[in-house]
């Protein structure tokens, strides 16, 4: 086909000789053509719709990629001749750097359904060269990691040695989709979630007297986990006193948040303090009530069959521990004013004689 009508874009890949890095070309078909083949969200906000009608397609066919040999030979089908280049929907992925990737790459829809479609193509002139050794030592890596739950940033490798003030306007893409919220050489992430992982592309324009080039770099971002630096946090009980009715059953719940630990051995137990005595209570097994990649919330209840007068003189303590340290929360029971009659009080006193049976000591839970 005649490629003279294709829109043209010049790209520069300055690769680091010290690292393995990838490169990506997007098939930037004009609007509305592109929307039929790629995600609309890939388009830059400055693109103006082209009014040529373009055949609609319900099954969103892929685009076809070609490489134009420099000697004027016919176009080569990428898939047949270049095993290190992977074609995926509207992107072309170069798995290995090298000046041999320099050349012209053409993309167009696979399915040509109208006379207008013939001119629907993009020619990308790619120049590939090794980064000069004069480049700064601490340039950002093409593989960057973000710690889950913390703050972090993703830096554009080709601009990481420049201050934010001197940095040109940058266009960012994540997994092929335009990120319109930032034009800086760094994406700041307030809190890292798993969805922040992916393939990021940063583009900026470099101009000389003769022409203008888009300098592009690709960053693989992983979200990583690490052991918490915090002791567990008791979420419940919040109050140190609890109003109760004598003679009635009572359940006190202890809920605690444990931060991520690669080797997870949470301890959660209830014990009772009575004057100078202190003993651990046999209570139902702890259970995980919410688990995320960042933390886990565990609950364990203490159950009193009937609240007695003696219980009002005791302190109920929830104890939680991880490898960093422990946290406790004490609860004192307080009789509800105006609650219960004489029968309840007699019943509660009767139970006091048997209450030692309720508490067996030493029970550990390991999650």
């Amino acid at each position: 086909f005649n490629i003279s009508g294709c829109s043209t874009k010049k790209l520069l890949w300055a690769y680091s000789t010290r690292s393995e890095e990838e490169f990506i070309l997007f098939c930037d078909l004009p609007e509305p053509q592109k929307s039929h083949f790629c995600h609309r969200s890939q388009l830059s906000p400055t693109q103006v719709p082209d009014h040529l009608p373009f055949t609609d397609s319900k099954d969103l066919p892929d685009v076809q990629w070609y490489r134009q040999p420099s000697n004027g030979d016919p176009l080569e089908d990428i898939r047949k001749s270049y095993p290190h280049i992977i074609q995926d929907k509207c992107t072309l992925r170069f798995l290995t750097p090298g000046v041999n990737n320099t050349g012209s790459y053409i993309c167009r829809p696979k399915m040509i359904k109208s006379p207008y479609d013939v001119a629907c193509c993009v020619k990308m002139i790619l120049e590939v060269k090794p980064q000069s050794n004069a480049s700064c030592e601490n340039s950002a890596s093409h593989k960057q990691d973000l710690l889950l739950g913390s703050t972090g940033s993703i830096s554009c490798p080709s601009l990481s040695c420049q201050s934010d003030a001197q940095s040109p306007e940058v266009t960012w893409y994540k997994n092929g989709k335009l990120l319109s919220m930032t034009r800086s050489n760094r994406i700041v992430v307030d809190e890292v979630y798993i969805y922040h992982q992916g393939t990021y592309v940063c583009d900026y324009t470099q101009s000389d007297t003769a022409s203008s080039w888009t300098v592009r770099a690709v960053v693989q971002v992983r979200t990583i986990v690490g052991d918490t630096k915090l002791k567990p946090d008791i979420l419940d009980p919040v109050e140190s006193t609890l109003e109760v009715e004598l003679g009635k059953p009572l359940t006190i719940s202890c809920k605690a948040r444990f931060g991520f630990e690669r080797v997870f051995n949470p301890v959660m137990k209830w014990y009772i303090k009575d004057a100078d005595l202190e003993w651990e209570v046999s209570v139902p097994e702890a259970k995980s009530i919410k688990s995320t990649l960042k933390d886990e919330i565990i609950e364990r209840n203490i159950i009193l069959e009937k609240v007695t007068q003696r219980d009002l003189r005791r302190t109920f303590v929830c104890f939680v521990q991880n490898s960093i340290g422990n946290t406790t929360q004490s609860v004192q029971l307080k009789e509800k004013r105006g609650s219960g009659g004489l029968n309840d009080i007699f019943e509660a006193q009767k139970i006091e004689w048997h209450e030692t049976v309720r508490f067996q000591s030493h029970h550990h839970h390991h999650h």
Partner: antibody, heavy 124, light 107 residues
Framework: QVQLQESGPGLVKPSETLSLTCTVS????????WSWIRQPPGKGLEWIGY???????NYNPSLKSRVTISVDTSKNQFSLKLSSVTAADTAVYYC??????????????????WGQGTTVTVSS | AIQLTQSPSSLSASVGDRVTITCRAS??????LAWYQQKPGKAPKFLIY???SLESGVPSRFSGSGSGTDFTLTISSLQPEDFATYYC?????????FGQGTRLEIK
């Protein structure tokens, strides 16, 4: 790019303590786990233990009583001490970055960057 | 400790051959398995994680499969630089353990 370099004596006497240091360059020690692995001559790989940059450790039970791994974030270094060594501790000792990667609803761990290894011989 | 048994212990093959190495765990480890390549006098190099995911920069001729107790590493078309020793590693439970290795030699 992150690079690791092991350093320490190549010869240790039996019953003494083997001490090695791994220096991390081209990146931060923060946010990662750091492991020690060894390989006796002509044999396979044996994991010794890891430390998280904040200081939490986990050791191979077969060596636990003799191993201490520590970290110095200010120097971007972590260290291995193995006490009461015998000839069976003769090996190439590697340090590695041991990263926990979050994926969907789980994690996987990989040793994605390794030092070039240092040979330690235990002999009198 | 979970034991990983690799088979074969060694094999000879030619450039262009398709090669499969297996790794069997003594108990289920889900997909918590990685593969490493080690050349003589060098440190191991990480190839595959989570049983089947290829590390970026690793040639696509390498692939991994399996979950539970049985895993395989396949090299679809051997290249001269692929002759090395391959190790599987589990991180499902502690201690972390490695297979005994499979030595891949030129026929």
């Amino acid at each position: 790019q992150v690079q690791l370099q092991e350093s320490g004596p190549g010869l240790v006497k039996p019953s003494e303590t083997l001490s090695l240091t791994c220096t991390v360059s081209g990146g931060s020690i923060n946010n990662y786990y750091w492991s020690w692995i060894r390989q006796p001559p002509g044999k396979g790989l044996e994991w010794i233990g890891y430390i998280f940059y904040s200081g939490t450790t986990n050791y191979n039970p077969s060596l636990k009583s003799r191993v201490t791994i520590s970290v110095d974030t200010s120097k971007n270094q972590f260290s291995l001490k193995l006490s009461s060594v015998t000839a069976a501790d003769t090996a190439v000792y590697y340090c590695a970055r041991d990263v926990g990667i979050a994926a969907r609803n789980s994690y996987y761990y990989v040793m994605d960057v390794w030092g070039q290894g240092t040979t330690v011989t235990v002999s009198s | 400790a979970i034991q990983l048994t690799q088979s074969p212990s060694s094999l000879s093959a030619s450039v262009g051959d398709r090669v499969t190495i297996t790794c069997r765990a003594s108990q289920g480890i889900s997909s918590a398995l990685a593969w490493y390549q080690q050349k003589p006098g060098k440190a191991p190099k990480f190839l595959i994680y989570e049983g089947s995911s290829l590390e970026s920069g690793v040639p696509s001729r390498f692939s991994g499969s399996g979950s539970g107790t049985d895993f395989t590493l396949t090299i679809s078309s051997l290249q001269p630089e692929d002759f090395a020793t391959y190790y599987c590693q589990q991180f499902n439970s502690y201690p972390i353990t490695f297979g005994q290795g499979t030595r891949l030699e030129i026929k």
